[in-house]
Structure formats: structure tokens, C-alpha cells
């Protein structure tokens, strides 16, 4: 059956808005002509003032934030959960790959420890680090490691003679390191490795972040007054005629809809375009594309470059003994 | 070859030697945040349509509100939905999105190009640089075992994939996600008491 | 699924004040309406008073008006009840209750209530 | 000020019978505003009908709600021993601005 008829005193508009604005006496007696008001444009006499028109204007926008952020609860949550998840899972990774390093090398090369588990820690922390988007070179991570590690190497294990902390000795063999390419091409290959897994894996982390964002800011945005006054048309503009529980028409609500949201279905083309894109990352995402194969194998491949080390091992000494003598015999005298 | 390290960990279930079935990978994590994600693809698209189903518009009713007054549902005046005096929509999708939607969209292209940037082409997961460097030995790669250790022996295959879930406080089932809508069948007369926003029939 | 969870009895001497606690879980609760009722012991149902969360506004009714405090904390997702000035009429048990909303707009129904605080 | 009178007080029947509760407002209250609520023993309320009519979810088909103006009534077509508890109407919308009725057990 259709409604009442307004109610002839504005008593019970009165009573709806005086939830949302207590105590203030807003709400006209009796109908009034309403010739001020600029939204709610009455046909006949009405129970709303401007003032309450403003209070509508307001509680429409945030009545349409609601909407907005539970509209994208679920997608929201889906990320935030799986970024966390993904981040922790990561850093998971890297604690055992630094574990496996580390029992590596007290297994096979027990001399070599405790300095060997300050470099693999140091090595490893900046993983973690440029994981989370840090400006680190990971090149420049490689190139240190094993150049912390070769003058331990030489002298731990090549050299045993040569009396320990000799630092001019220390950086005469870092540079040997790279000039006689002591540990033959594996520090390139674990650059390219570990360059290409922690890239893809720091981009796939960055995009989960920004998605995140993305809904954050559709979640928060602040719509435009023209909005503002076609969401109250529809939604309150039947309160001033004692209205309360009729409802727009279905049409009438899509055509406001995509009128406010015009802007922010804009970013649908995008949107779009990030999910495919993150899935061709994620479908690429293995063999050395893949952080967690790439760095749970590192400790072999260092293992396999120390082993290079010790078969070149006669040749290296003598060719060093030469290259770094100046060192050795300052340190000597 | 590398002595296997064993005796440092507590988690040495994690380096499982046989393949066990349906074991959650990060991988498979990936491509079921991917798949998930694929079923939000038309969110922006679908939002105008989506905040109308879910406030409160006439469905049932035979009167509806057309911004002005109260009409038939399906009358001229329904379609016509009042405004025609009052805003000039074309004029209002005319103005573009607002600066932070115009920023987000920036962010989202540059992302999109970094993702595509880094996007491994099909069939070139390997540099033949890397090939001819040894990195793949040849007898280790069935299934996502590999092999991790030089050749020679003692060897070991290890599962590829950790099964760090177990080790994740987190339980991603999205059905239990705060939020998730009930979709019921409203029958006619009925409320679904649900916590969409405007939880009238 | 919304659901209120109050918290515990009380025992208080006349002319002190009690402050109830109504922590709701599910849905968004800023978009709720929250209603205080009280029901005294073999009696009916008395509103007390209500808030809407994302407005921080509050009615009361007349009965309790100046002896009634209610608020919500949106970050924990919980109302309260503050009556002072107790006297032994307001032995009760005192229930919180969603109402149902268009808008934000409480139309006045209460569909999920708490257990009551004694 | 807007009082809900209830009847009868108590009504006692059996198992299969039709019962029928009564609620009068002082002032004409709109059928949208008017709301019935059944509450047993050591429990809260539950809201079984609004808008005068209409039944919320989960509530047997037995239980209907019809009315408008200053009269309206609560019928349980045929009684379950479960529907043993007492009912209240509430209106909402006239100073104070929820009034509850007095009850029927």
C-alpha cells in the first residue's frame, strides 16, 4: 500500500533527523514552502530547512565512504593478508638460506668460521634489505662477499703461515680477488642469479603494496559537491516530505552512481592491466626467476667457488706471493 | 660436493626428499593470490552497480523515489529519475577525475610498466649465458625438485619449494574474510540481516 | 555476522556511576546505530538512548537525560553507557543493540543485542 | 507523549492454538515504525517483525504482524511449546523517541 501521507506536523522527521543532529532545532513546526532550499526542491510545502539539507549533504558523503570501503572489504583484505604473508614468507627464505650458508661452511670449512658467518649474516641482511626496496647494488653485495671472504680463504686456508689481521695484506688480496678472478665465473653467476630473483621478487612485493594503495585511496576519496547533492536527492530528499522508508528507483541509483563515479571507474583500464601484468610476473616467477630456489642453492654454488679456490689453490699462491710481497713484507719487517 | 647442512636446523622436516602432494608452495600461493585477484578484475568497473545493489534501491516496492517524488517503478517519471533541472550529469563526468584519482592512475602505470618490464617471456626462463655457465645440470629439474649441491657425490635433491605455511601464523581462507557478504536470496517480505551498509530489504 | 559482546555484572553503592562497555565484531560498526535499553527486574523494556558511531552523536531519552553519557570509540569498535547518580531504581539488567539503518539513518528496529550487564 | 498499551497481560494456551496479541498507541504511529520483539527467560530480545509487517530472517512463517493508525496485532497462527515467552511492541519516531509496550507473557 503507498505510504502515509506527510505528516501534517513534522514530528516524526523531526524525531529521524534528530538522530543524526541532536538538539538543535533544525526541523521546521509545521510544513514550510522551502524556497531556500537549493536540493531537496519541494514541490509542495516541506518539512526541511537548508541547514538540514546540509546535514544530509554530509552524512550522504560519508554514507557513500561506507559503501565504498565495504564494497572493497574483501578485495582489500585479500592483499593486505597476502603482502604480509608473502613479506614474512621472504624473510623466511632468507633466514634459512643464510642458515644453510652458514652450516655449510662450518661443515666443510670449519677454519673459515666465525669470520665466514659475519660476511654470510652481513650478505644476507642486505637481501632482506633490498627486498623491502632498499638502494642497494646487488652486484655490490656479490662482489663484497667474496671479497670479505678470499683474504680469509688465503689466509685460513692457502697461507696458513701469514700472521692474522694483516689489513695491507687483506686489501691487496681483495683486489687480487677480482683482478685474477680467483673464484673463476661463480660470483657472476650468483650476481645473475640473485640480481633476477630479487628483482622480480621486490617488484612483485612493490605491486601487492601499491594494489593496497590503490584501494585505499578509492576507499577514502572525497566526492564532489555535485555528487554530494545527487546522493541526497536520492537518498534523503524523500525524508522532507515524511518519507522515510520508500526507496530510489533502480535506474535512478545507477545513473547517480556512475555520475559520481565517473572518475574512479577511470581507473579500470589500469586496474585491469596491473592484474594481468602481476600474473605474467607470477607465471615467470621460477628457476632463477625464483628467490626462494635461487637463494636456498646458494650455499652449494659458494661451496662450488671455494673448491675452485683450493684446486687452483699452487697457482694462486705463487701468483699472489708475487702481486701482494710488497704487503707481506711490510708486515714482516 | 657440499657436506649437506644438517645438524643446524630444527626445521629440518622442511627439506623433504619426496614429493609430497597438494603441498602449499609459495608458488602455488602466487597463483592463488592471481587467480583470486582475476575475480576482482572488474572492480572499479562494476562499483557503480555494485554500491546500487547493495543500498537500499526499489525492488520489490511498486513506488520508487525519483529524486523529486514518489512514482510508479516502472513509469516515465522512474526512468526520467528527477534531475533533469537540477545537475547536468554529462557535465559532471566531463570535469575528469579528481587529482588523487589521476595520481593513483599514475602509480598504477608505473607499476604496470615495471611489471611488464620484468616479466619473464615464455621460453626464455633461462640466459643461455647462465646454460653455459653450468647452472642447470641436466639430470635435476622433475617436478619442482632441484638440486641443490654440486655433482658428485652426496648430492642431495631437495623439494625446491619450502612449506612455509605451516610456519605462517596467517590462514588466508578468504570465505572467512571480515566482510565477505552473505548473498541470500531475500525472499519478499524478509530482511536478510546482513552488515552490507543500508541493511534494509 | 554482527555480534555485541558487553562487558561484565556490577555492583554499585547509590550515588556513584557505572560505565558499560559494548564491543561489536562483524560488519562496519561506524555505520551502525547503538541503542541502550534496560529492563529492571519483572519489568518491560526502557530506551535509554542511542549513538551513531560515524557522527559521535547521541540522543537520550528525556528520563535519563543529564544522568546518561553515551559514547563510541570507532578504533576498538565499542559503545558505552555511563549512568550516574545510581540510586537502587536502577537495578536493572542493560542491554546494547544494533539498530537498524537506511544511510545511516536508525530506523528504529534493533536486530542484534547484546546478552545484557547485570 | 506516545504510550504502546498491550493485551491481554497474559495469555495461556496450548500447543496448535491461534494466539493473538494486541498493541493500542496513544497517537497514530506509521505502520513503518512499529516493531515486535519476543524475549524468554534469561535471554535478550529478538526482533521478529518490523515495519508492522514484515517478518526479519529466520523467524517461522507462523508468526505475523498486521495493524496501522493506533491499532495493531501480533498472531501466532498454530503455537509451538518453543514460542512460550514474552512479547513486546515498539514504536519509533514520536517523543520519547522509542516506546516499548508493557508486554504479553
Known amino acids: 500500500q503507498p505510504p502515509p501521507p506527510p505528516d501534517a506536523t513534522c514530528h516524526q522527521v523531526r524525531s529521524f533527523f534528530q538522530r543524526l543532529q541532536p538538539g538543535l532545532k533544525w526541523v521546521p513546526e509545521t510544513p514550510v514552502p522551502g524556497s531556500d532550499l537549493q536540493v531537496c526542491l519541494p514541490k509542495g510545502p516541506t518539512c526541511c530547512s537548508r541547514k538540514m539539507e546540509e546535514k544530509y549533504q554530509l552524512t550522504a558523503r560519508l554514507n557513500m565512504e561506507q559503501l565504498l570501503q565495504s564494497a572493497s572489504m574483501e578485495l582489500k583484505f585479500l592483499i593486505i593478508q597476502n603482502a604480509a604473508v608473502f613479506q614474512e614468507a621472504f624473510e623466511i627464505v632468507v633466514r634459512h638460506a643464510k642458515n644453510y650458508t652458514n652450516a655449510m661452511f662450518k661443515n666443510n670449512y670449519p677454519s673459515l668460521t666465525p669470520q665466514a658467518f659475519e660476511f654470510v649474516g652481513e650478505f644476507f641482511t642486505d637481501v632482506s634489505l633490498y627486498i623491502l626496496g632498499s638502494d642497494i647494488n646487488v652486484d655490490d653485495m656479490v662482489n663484497e662477499l667474496f671479497d670479505s671472504l678470499f683474504p680469509v680463504i688465503y689466509t685460513q686456508m692457502m697461507n696458513p703461515g701469514l700472521p692474522e689481521s694483516v689489513l695491507d695484506i687483506n686489501e691487496c688480496l681483495r683486489g687480487a680477488r677480482r683482478d685474477l678472478k680467483v673464484f673463476g665465473s661463480f660470483p657472476k653467476l650468483i650476481m645473475t642469479q640473485v640480481s633476477k630473483s630479487l628483482q622480480v621478487t621486490r617488484i612483485f612485493l612493490q605491486a601487492l603494496n601499491l594494489g593496497i594503495e590503490v584501494i585505499n585511496t578509492t576507499d577514502h576519496l572525497k566526492f564532489s559537491k555535485d555528487c554530494g547533492r545527487m546522493l541526497t536527492r536520492m537518498w534523503y530528499c524523500s525524508y522532507c516530505q515524511g518519507l522515510m522508508m520508500v526507496k530510489p528507483c533502480g535506474g535512478y541509483c545507477n545513473v547517480v552512481m556512475q555520475g559520481c563515479m565517473a572518475g574512479v571507474v577511470e581507473i579500470d583500464k589500469y586496474w585491469r592491466e596491473y592484474i594481468l601484468s602481476l600474473e605474467e610476473l607470477v607465471n615467470g616467477m621460477y628457476r632463477i626467476y625464483d628467490m626462494e630456489n635461487v637463494l636456498l642453492g646458494l650455499f652449494s654454488t659458494i661451496h662450488d667457488s671455494i673448491q675452485y679456490v683450493q684446486k687452483n689453490g699452487g697457482k694462486l699462491t705463487t701468483t699472489i706471493g708475487k702481486l701482494c710481497a710488497h704487503s707481506q713484507q711490510r708486515q714482516y719487517r | 660436493s657440499a657436506y649437506y647442512p644438517e645438524d643446524l636446523f630444527i626445521d629440518k622436516k622442511i627439506l623433504k626428499v619426496a614429493h609430497v602432494e597438494h603441498e602449499e608452495t609459495l608458488s602455488s600461493r602466487r597463483r592463488e593470490l592471481i587467480q583470486k585477484l582475476k575475480s576482482f578484475i572488474n572492480f572499479y568497473s562494476a562499483l557503480p552497480g555494485y554500491i546500487c545493489s547493495h543500498s537500499p534501491v526499489a525492488e520489490n516496492d511498486t513506488l520508487c523515489w525519483n529524486g523529486q517524488e514518489l512514482v510508479e517503478r516502472y513509469s516515465q517519471k522512474a526512468a526520467r529519475n528527477g534531475m533533469k533541472n537540477q545537475f547536468n550529469l554529462h557535465e559532471l563526468k566531463m570535469k575528469g577525475p579528481e587529482p588523487v584519482v589521476s595520481q593513483i592512475i599514475d602509480k598504477l602505470k608505473h607499476i604496470n610498466q615495471l611489471l611488464r618490464t620484468m616479466s619473464v617471456p615464455k621460453g626464455k626462463v633461462l640466459d643461455k649465458s647462465l646454460d653455459e655457465e653450468g647452472l642447470e645440470s641436466g639430470d635435476c629439474g622433475d617436478d619442482e625438485d632441484e638440486c641443490i649441491g654440486s655433482s658428485g657425490d652426496g648430492m642431495v635433491k631437495v623439494k625446491n619449494q619450502l612449506r612455509f605455511l605451516a610456519e605462517l601464523a596467517y590462514d588466508l581462507d578468504v570465505d572467512d574474510a571480515p566482510g565477505n557478504k552473505q548473498h541470500g536470496n531475500q525472499k519478499d517480505n524478509e530482511i536478510t540481516t546482513s552488515h552490507s551498509v543500508g541493511n534494509m530489504p | 555476522e554482527v555480534q555485541l559482546v558487553q562487558s561484565g555484572a556490577e555492583v554499585k553503592k547509590p550515588g556513584s556511576s557505572v560505565k558499560v562497555s559494548c564491543k561489536a565484531s562483524?560488519?562496519?560498526?561506524?555505520?551502525?546505530?547503538i541503542s541502550w535499553v534496560r529492563q529492571a527486574p519483572g519489568q518491560g523494556l526502557e530506551w535509554m538512548g542511542g549513538?551513531?558511531?560515524?557522527?559521535?552523536?547521541?540522543n537520550y531519552a528525556q528520563k535519563f537525560q543529564g544522568r546518561v553519557t553515551i559514547t563510541a570509540d570507532k578504533s576498538t569498535s565499542t559503545a558505552y553507557m555511563e549512568l550516574s547518580s545510581l540510586r537502587s531504581e536502577d537495578t536493572a539488567v542493560y542491554y546494547c543493540?544494533?539498530?537498524?539503518?537506511?544511510?545511516?539513518?536508525?530506523?528504529?528496529?534493533?536486530?542484534?543485542w547484546g546478552k545484557g550487564t547485570t | 507523549e506516545t504510550t504502546l498499551t498491550q493485551s491481554p497481560g497474559t495469555l495461556s494456551l496450548s500447543p496448535g492454538e491461534r494466539a493473538t496479541l494486541s498493541c493500542r498507541a496513544s497517537?497514530?504511529?506509521?505502520?513503518?515504525?512499529l516493531a515486535w520483539y519476543q524475549q524468554k527467560p534469561g535471554q535478550a530480545p529478538r526482533l521478529l517483525i518490523y515495519a508492522a509487517s514484515s517478518r526479519t530472517t529466520g523467524v517461522p512463517d507462523r508468526f505475523s504482524g498486521s495493524g496501522s493508525g493506533t491499532d495493531f496485532t501480533l498472531t501466532i497462527s498454530r503455537l509451538e511449546p518453543e514460542d512460550s515467552a514474552v512479547y513486546y511492541c515498539q514504536q519509533y519516531g514520536y517523543s520519547p523517541l522509542y516506546t516499548f509496550g508493557q508486554g504479553t507473557k
Open positions: 549513538i551513531i558511531p560515524i557522527f559521535g552523536t547521541a
Open positions: 562483524g560488519g562496519t560498526f561506524s555505520s551502525y546505530a
Open positions: 497517537h497514530s504511529v506509521s505502520s513503518n515504525f
Open positions: 543493540a544494533r539498530e537498524w539503518q537506511q544511510q545511516l539513518v536508525p530506523l528504529g528496529y534493533m536486530d542484534v
